[in-house]
């Protein structure tokens, strides 16, 4: 397991919300990518492949998430204080072997700017 | 401990069908992509057919498309192969097996833990 | 699809002694997509070595897998009384497929 800090933006803010971006190399095929808050599982993706290229999803713990082709974000939204944290991408590389779990992370701090809804 | 029991085999004549059933149990089963996998006693291995964790994706040997239908039930822990239109050439022990890493695929997996397996016979 | 053949066909040692097998891919097995498998009579294979190098869980260390592209070889280092098996290669991209085997048997 290699362990380190994401050398680049993780987090990007918006509206209230935060977007965690989890990067894989372009070259994997199948993996599991899993978005720890400490250590506690928030979010969880699969992709796999069949014959023919056929792609298939699943989310274990679901949250609102987006894939491309070296990437998965996660989103959190309303913000409170609680969210701040270490966040780390847990990623489960199936295909191409060897099988290889890495894990990147990074500090989100919450700033009054950032909070969802913030009192007047 | 993880266990895969294969049942459903058995003597047919050729042309006949038979229901092959794969029970798994201490393993969180649709975490895993499943195959089959059989073996002429005495001979090497082939692999027949595979599913995904949910059976939206399925493939198998060309030996056997066409007339083995791959499927599965997560609720109940199962993994099943319908064989129709069975030949002699089909008789062999039947395997079923995971795929190794807990991934959900078939494809491009190999596997690790396999059942003792159940024997098919195609005669006259 | 990629055909596999492994040699040889059997192999005569005693125990203690290093053992090498080999399988050779009619074309190039991408991405080291190669497993070795062992079984012995009446159970079913045992995965050994995945990605042609990786050793599977609880796999001792005296097995080895090494090889790229077309040609392949599974090592035993010293050959324990319970290695004495059937050995099967297999490419698993796409459509899984085995070699006819490799027995290992006492001299």
């Known amino acids: 397991e290699i362990n380190g800090s994401a050398n680049y933006e993780m987090f990007i803010f918006h509206n209230g919300g935060v977007q965690i971006l989890c990067k894989y190399p372009d070259i994997v095929q199948q993996f599991k990518m899993q978005l720890l808050k400490g250590g506690q599982i928030l979010c969880d993706l699969t992709k796999t492949k069949g014959s023919g290229n056929t792609v298939s999803i699943k989310s274990l713990k679901f949250c609102h998430s987006q894939l491309s082709n070296n990437s998965v974000s996660f989103f959190l939204y309303n913000l409170d204080r609680s969210h701040a944290n270490y966040y780390f991408c847990n990623l489960s590389i199936f295909d191409p072997p060897p099988f290889k779990v890495t894990l990147t992370g990074g500090y989100l701090h919450i700033y009054e700017s950032q909070l969802c809804c913030q009192l007047k | 401990e993880v266990q895969l029991v294969e049942s459903g085999g058995g003597v047919v004549r050729p042309g006949g069908s038979l229901r092959l059933s794969c029970a798994a149990s201490g393993l969180t089963f649709d975490d895993y992509g499943m195959s089959w996998v059989r073996q002429v006693p005495g001979k090497g291995l082939e692999w027949v057919s595979g599913?995904?964790?949910?059976?939206?994706?399925?493939d198998y040997a060309d030996s056997v498309k066409g007339r083995f239908t791959i499927s599965r039930d997560n609720a109940k822990n199962s993994l099943y192969l319908q064989m129709n239109s069975l030949r002699a050439e089909d008789t062999a022990l039947y395997y079923c097996?995971?795929?190794?890493?807990?991934?959900?695929?078939?494809?491009?997996?190999?596997?690790?833990?396999w059942g003792q397996g159940t024997l098919v016979t195609v005669s006259s | 699809e990629i055909v596999l053949t492994q040699s040889p066909g059997t192999l005569s040692l005693s125990p203690g002694e290093r053992a090498t097998l080999s399988c050779r891919a009619s074309q190039s097995v991408s991405s080291s997509y190669l497993a070795w498998y062992q079984q012995k009579p009446g159970q079913a294979p045992r995965l050994l070595i995945y990605?042609?190098?990786s050793r599977a869980t609880g796999i001792p260390d005296r097995f080895s897998g090494s090889g790229s592209g077309t040609d392949f070889t599974l090592t035993i280092r010293r050959l324990e009384p319970e290695d004495f098996a059937v050995y099967y290669c297999q490419q698993y991209g796409s459509s899984p497929f085995f070699g006819p085997g490799t027995k290992v048997d006492i001299k």
């Open positions: 097996a995971r795929d190794y890493y807990g991934s959900g695929s078939y494809y491009n997996v190999p596997f690790d833990y």
């Open positions: 990605g042609a190098s």
């Open positions: 599913i995904n964790w949910n059976g939206d994706n399925t």
